[in-house]
Each structure stands twice: as C-alpha cells, then as structure tokens.
Interface confidence: medium
C-alpha cells in the first residue's frame, strides 16, 4: 500500500510551488493530452546561457513515514532540436530536498537543501517526436531518508535544461492491513528493522471464531520495506460449529455441522439424524438409531439389524451345519457379526441345557462373519437348538437381540472318520474312529469295497475294531471304501465314499488318500 | 490574410526534373511547419513531402523518396520542391499547405500539425 | 504506413438531409484525424481538426467524432454549398495519409 503525501499531477494546477528566481525559469502551463488538460512546471531556457532556476513545492507533511519514495514523471528535449545548437543547453536537472518542523513559506534558501541525485532521461525527445507531438516520458524514482522532522520540501534545479515535469509523486509504502490464512494483519509502516533485518515479523490475530491449530504456530507475516506481506507462518481454522467463507468464519447453517477446528467446510448432518441448529458441532440421532464411540460424527447414525433371514440346520449324522442369510435389516451398517448358541434337550425328560462345552464348532461361534458354520460331536437322540444372533456396532447400545433359532433331532451316530494305514500291491489297511461319546452305542462296523468304475459288484466285511484290512485285491488299482456303523437301532451314518489304491507291482509309490 | 501561392508546374516529359515554389504571406513562414500535398486528376489527396519551421527534419512519401527533395528560405517566405527522374505517375495537382508548427522553445509541443492553410495548387503534367 | 478506408465513396444526398460519413484506420491513431472538403477545381479546406474540433470559420452543421480507429463526420443539415468531396486525414505519424474520398451528390 502506497500512502500518498504528494501528487502534483493530482491537484490540477492548484498546487501553487514557489520558484525562484520569481518570475524567470519554472512556470505552471496546461496543455492537452489526450484530450485531457494536464499541467506541467516546465522550463526550457536553453539560449541564455548558465541557469540556476529552483522549483520548490509546498510544505509536506511526514505523517509516519521513516522512507519515502519519490516518483518524477518528465519531459526532456534533446538539445540538438534547437535552431542554432543552443550552446548552453543540458539534459538533465538536479532534485534536493530539505526537512523542517515548520513551514517557511516563501522563506527559500538553497543552502537548507541536500541533494538527492541528478535525474538524466532515459529518453529525450528529439525533433521528429516533438513535431509528431509523441511525448516521451521518463519516469524516475528515488529514495530518501530516513527523515526524523515533522515534514519536507522537495526542490527541483534547472541547470539549463528543456524540461517538463509532468508529475511529482511522494509517497511512503505501509504494509496494507490484510486477512490471510483467517488472521488479521494490521496495517505496518515499511520499515528496515535493521540494515541485516529487512523484514519487520508481525503477529496476526485469528478473526472471529477462528482458533489456532492445537499443537501449531501462530499467525506472523513479514513486512518488508516496499510494503510487501512475504512468508506466512502458522494460520488459523475456523473453530468447530464454523467454516470458512472468504476471509472469515461462518457459523454451519441449521441442518449442517463440524465437529473439529479445520480447513474443511461443514458437513451435511448425515441420515437418521435430527436437524440442527445453527453453528451445530454435531447432529443427533433420530429416536431409535445410534453412533458406535468409534463412529465419525459424519456418519449417519444407524441401528441394530433385524434377526438372520432363513436359518436352516442340515443334519449330517452327528454333526448339523447351519446356513443362514444376511438380515434383511442390516440397519445401515456393513459391520454385522453373527453368534451361535446352542441348546441340548433330552427327549425322554424333556431336560434341557446349553450344550456349548460338549459340542465342537467349524470356527469360533461368536464373532461369525460367515453365514455358516458346522457342528459337530452331536449326541444321537437328542435334540438341539440352535440360535443365531445377528448384530452390528450399535446393537451394544440396546439391550433387545436380534436372533433367529432352528432345531434338530440327532438320530444317527457320526459318520465314522476313515484313513488309509497302509497298503502294499494286493492289499489295504484300513482304520477308523468315531467319538468316544457315541461307541458304546456301536454293535459293529460294515465295510464296503469295490473296484472303481466297476458298479456290478462289490464286497462287504464286518468288523467289531476300529481297523480292517482288505486282501485278495488287485494290483495298482482304485478301490472304493466305505465304513458305515451298525447300532442297535439299525445303519448309523456312512462314512464318505474314499478312493484307495494298491501299489503296482513294480512298487514304491506314494501312498494316495 | 494568410497566402499560400504556388508556381513552376508545367508539362515535362518523364525521366525530366521540375523545381516548384510556394511563396508565403500573411503570417510568419519562419514559425510554420510546411508540407506538400498532391492530387492527381480524379483521384484523391495524396502527403508528397514536409519540412520543419527551421530547414529541419524533412520527410517524404515512399513513392518520392529520393527523387524529391523538399526546402524552404524563410528569408524569402518560400517553400520549394525539387522534383527529378519525374514519372507519369507523378502527374497531378501539387498543393503547398502549412501548420502551426509549435516550434517554441516549450519543452512539450501544444498545437497539432494539421493542414491549415493551402494554396491554390499547380499541375504538372509528364508526358512525352 | 496507416491505411484510411472511407465508406461510402459517394453518396446522393438532398438538401436538409443528415449525412454521414466514416473514416477507418488501419490501427489507432488517439484523435489524430482531420477533415477535409474539397471542391472541383479548388483547394481542400480544413473542416475538423483533432477529431473533433471545429476549425475556425467552419459552420457548425459541421462535427467530427471518434477516437482509436473510427471516425465519423456528420452534417446535421446538408446545404447546397455542402456538395463537394470530402477526405480525412490522420496524423499520428509522418507519413500522413488520406482517405480516398467520399463524393457528395446531389439526389
């Protein structure tokens, strides 16, 4: 920002500066460019020999300047325009100045003033420029001080020159008040704080409703002597509840908010939430939905999901794998675990009882993130209950459950678990095991065989021990094994079908199960 | 009253030289810029050449150049143009006009350089 | 050089009548136009100098306007002694230029 204490051009020839000597050298004229008036001091005495003409403006109050800049707009004619050479004629003029407290009026006395420079044009104007009418003008800047009285005059000295000063313009350079980063700059005097510190540090004031970081710096900008802002350090955010518009914080419209001092904006109070208020730092839940502790403020608030859709329970012998489908209801949340519990009842005394400790499941039963899961080590006559409860992040927040339950009655004994032992090119040993709980119920064991790809015959072997071995077979060849159980009650579960083969005659090969 | 009187036209054949003159009056010739115009029949205004107040600088059209040379004697008030190697084209109307020159001592010129005053004019003719 | 285009080249007119005629050029040249009437057989005579201004002893049906590169004249009331061609002429640089002319006739 440029603060202005004098501009010639400005005043329209009102500005009535004081030449000596009176009446001869400087004097005010208008002329039009541009189809504008504009006035000049001009002087043009370059046929009569040496020149001491002195223009001096009026007083000029220093206000708080310590530098100020000095702008001179001017005309300079080229001596070899004249008829005749004019022997006498210089190019350039010299410009001083003088500070006082007071005012001396017309009291002018050249030894007051020092001298600043000599200004020379970087142009002159030469005949067919000054015939054409195209007015070469020279713009030269100086500064000066730093000044320490009240105020100052300028004076301009003619040596001999044909000259026009169009415009004088003396100004001193401020810091302009600024808003950057949301703090507040005051205006600042351009000054050298020293000669190897030229930038003066200001500290900045955050604007309304504006804070600084936690854990960062504080505004500062660096002032420099041509009033120039450098380097911003630090900033301010707009504090929760306000966002940034422009320069300043704006309080978050009714149905918005910000939960945090920060650059962005405010946010759309998310689903299922209740409309806010003006400057909201958060938007509450709707009556029925919630936010989990680790939830952000925008996200939309959610609920607990509705119960597992179609819960069915296969039985497999001793063992009963649970399907089931996604809640038709997640409740608008994508973190749904499922738990299974189970219930044993006996069917003669109508007993019943958790049954976690005594059964075994495929995965841990709580925490499912499938939607399946196998239990196994059934016992036979009984019947079980199984629940599966559907829950998400929020479902901790209610104390109702969201569960659906299947039964099933254990009739069969597991099916028994079958390994090859060992085998050799005309035979295979066969082992297998039930669990404990369940052999007392076991009368004997039924294994059947045949060749693979022969389906017109098989072969059947009984067996009270876990293990059998199958002889007479043929070398290097795919036997199909199955082991079934026999109960009291008739046929337990069969086994799964195994592919066992005997070793070729040229021997070694790997045992394949 | 301000005058402008030209003289010197005539017929000449191409490749020949005329010298016209413009004798001034009623105003001071020594502070006028002067200038002259050409016309050829039934065409329009063509800038032939000017001269500053004192002699200097001189300026000419790019169809002249060189073949004209423009000059003045402001202790006779007469403005003259040597014409040479003189062409058909060339034929026409040759008008003297003069403006305010401004030529003062003044740091920045005041009056503008339009054609104020114009003689009567003169023809020239080349033919052979 | 700076060219000047001037439209129309002639023009029929009648007495009264408001006439316009315009003046381009071929880059800007502020207000450094003249223009000029000029009568068969006679010598032109300045009408409008620095675009606008009114020569001394012209009548003041007579006006110039414009600045850059158009320009106009205008007589707001076409008198008998107004017949004549008319030419304008900018002096931005040395080597000043005419327009060709516009011719006007009487209806």
């Known amino acids: 920002k440029e603060v202005v204490l004098l501009d010639f051009a400005a005043m329209k020839g009102e500005l009535g500066w004081l030449t000596h000597p009176y009446g001869k050298g400087w004097d005010l004229m208008q002329n039009i460019m541009d189809d504008m008036p504009i006035y000049m001091y001009s002087v043009c005495n370059v046929v009569s020999g040496d020149q001491d003409n002195w223009l001096r403006t009026n007083w000029v109050y220093r206000e708080e300047a310590e530098r100020i800049f000095i702008e001179l707009k001017f005309t300079v004619r080229d001596c070899n325009s004249f008829p005749g050479g004019a022997s006498s004629c210089k190019e350039t003029f010299n410009l001083y100045y003088a500070e006082s407290d007071v005012d001396y009026g017309t009291n002018f006395q050249k030894r007051q003033f020092t001298k600043i420079d000599t200004i020379a044009p970087d142009e002159i104007t030469v005949s067919s420029d000054f015939e054409a009418r195209n007015v070469k003008l020279n713009v030269e800047e100086r500064m000066v001080g730093p000044l320490t009285r009240k105020g100052f005059y300028l004076a301009f000295q003619d040596i001999g020159a044909c000259v026009a000063l169009l415009s004088v313009r003396v100004y001193y350079k401020k810091c302009p008040e600024m808003l950057q980063s949301l703090a507040r700059f005051p205006e600042t005097i351009a000054v050298a704080v020293s000669d190897t510190q030229p930038l003066a540090t200001v500290a900045g004031t955050c604007v309304d409703h504006a804070v600084v970081p936690y854990g960062g710096e504080g505004p500062l900008m660096h002032c420099t002597v041509d009033g120039e802002w450098l380097v911003p350090i630090g900033q301010c955010l707009c504090q929760e509840g306000y966002e940034k518009v422009e320069d300043a914080c704006r309080a978050c419209s009714p149905g918005f908010f910000k939960s945090e001092a920060s650059e962005s904006p405010c946010l759309e109070c998310p689903e299922h939430t209740l409309p806010s208020t003006e400057g909201a730092t958060s938007c509450q839940c709707e009556e029925g939905y919630f936010r989990a502790p680790e939830d952000p403020l925008s996200m939309s608030c959610t609920r607990p999901p509705s119960a597992p859709n179609y819960l069915t329970a296969i039985g497999m012998g001793a063992k009963v794998e649970l399907r089931w489908t996604a809640p038709k209801d997640t409740g608008g949340r994508q973190d749904i675990v499922y738990s299974v519990t189970c219930e044993q009842c006996w069917p003669e005394s109508g007993e019943c009882g958790p049954c976690e400790a005594s059964v075994r499941y495929s995965e841990p039963p709580h925490a499912l993130t499938r939607t399946s899961v196998t239990v196994s080590d059934l016992e036979p006559h009984m019947n079980y209950t199984f629940a599966v409860e559907a829950r998400n992040g929020v479902s901790g927040l209610v104390t109702s459950r969201s569960f659906r339950t299947a039964s099933v009655s254990i009739n069969q004994t597991e099916p028994p678990k079958v390994r090859l032992e060992d085998r050799s090119t005309t035979s295979l040993s066969v082992t297998w095991s039930i669990p404990v709980s369940q052999q007392s119920r076991v009368w004997k064991y039924e294994v059947t065989y045949r060749k693979k790809g022969d389906a017109n015959s098989y072969n059947v072997r009984r067996t009270e021990g876990f293990s059998v071995t199958l002889d007479d077979l043929a070398p290097d060849t795919t036997y199909l094994v199955q082991v079934q159980a026999l109960t009291q009650e008739g046929q337990g579960a069969g086994s799964k079908v195994h592919e066992f083969q005997t070793l070729s005659t040229e021997g070694s090969a790997n045992m394949a199960v | 009253e301000v005058q402008l009187l030209e003289s010197g036209g005539g017929l000449v054949q191409p490749g020949g030289s005329l010298r016209l003159s413009c004798a001034a009056s009623?105003?001071?010739?020594?502070?006028?810029?002067m200038a002259w115009v050409r016309q050829a029949p039934g065409k329009g205004l063509e800038w032939v050449s000017r001269?500053?107040?004192?002699?200097?600088?001189?300026h000419y059209a790019d169809s002249v150049k060189g073949r004209f040379t423009i000059s003045r004697d402001n202790s006779k008030n007469t403005l003259y143009l040597q014409m040479n190697s003189l062409r058909a084209e060339d034929t026409a109307v040759y008008y003297c006009?003069?403006?305010?020159?401004?030529?003062?001592?003044?740091?920045?010129?005041?009056?503008?350089?339009?054609?104020?005053?114009w003689g009567q004019g003169t023809l020239v003719t080349v033919s052979s | 050089d700076i060219q000047m285009t001037q439209s129309p080249s002639s023009l029929s007119a009648s007495v009264g009548d408001r006439v316009t005629i315009t003046c381009r050029a071929s880059?800007?040249?502020?207000?450094?136009l003249a223009w000029y009437q000029q009568k068969p057989g006679k010598a032109p005579k300045l009408l409008i100098y620095?675009?606008?201004n009114l020569h001394t002893g012209v009548p003041s049906r007579f006006s110039g306007s414009g600045s850059g590169t158009e320009f106009s004249l205008t007589i707001s009331g076409l008198q008998p002694d107004d017949f004549a061609t008319y030419y304008c002429?900018?002096?931005?640089?040395?080597?000043?230029?005419f327009g060709q002319g516009t011719k006007v006739e009487i209806k």
């Open positions: 006009a003069g403006y305010d020159s401004g030529y003062d001592y003044v740091a920045v010129a005041g009056p503008a350089e339009y054609f104020q005053h």
């Open positions: 009623g105003f001071t010739f020594s502070h006028y810029m």
């Open positions: 001269i500053g107040p004192s002699g200097g600088p001189t």
């Open positions: 880059q800007s040249i502020s207000t450094w």
């Open positions: 620095k675009a606008s």
């Open positions: 002429q900018q002096y931005n640089v040395y080597s000043r230029t």
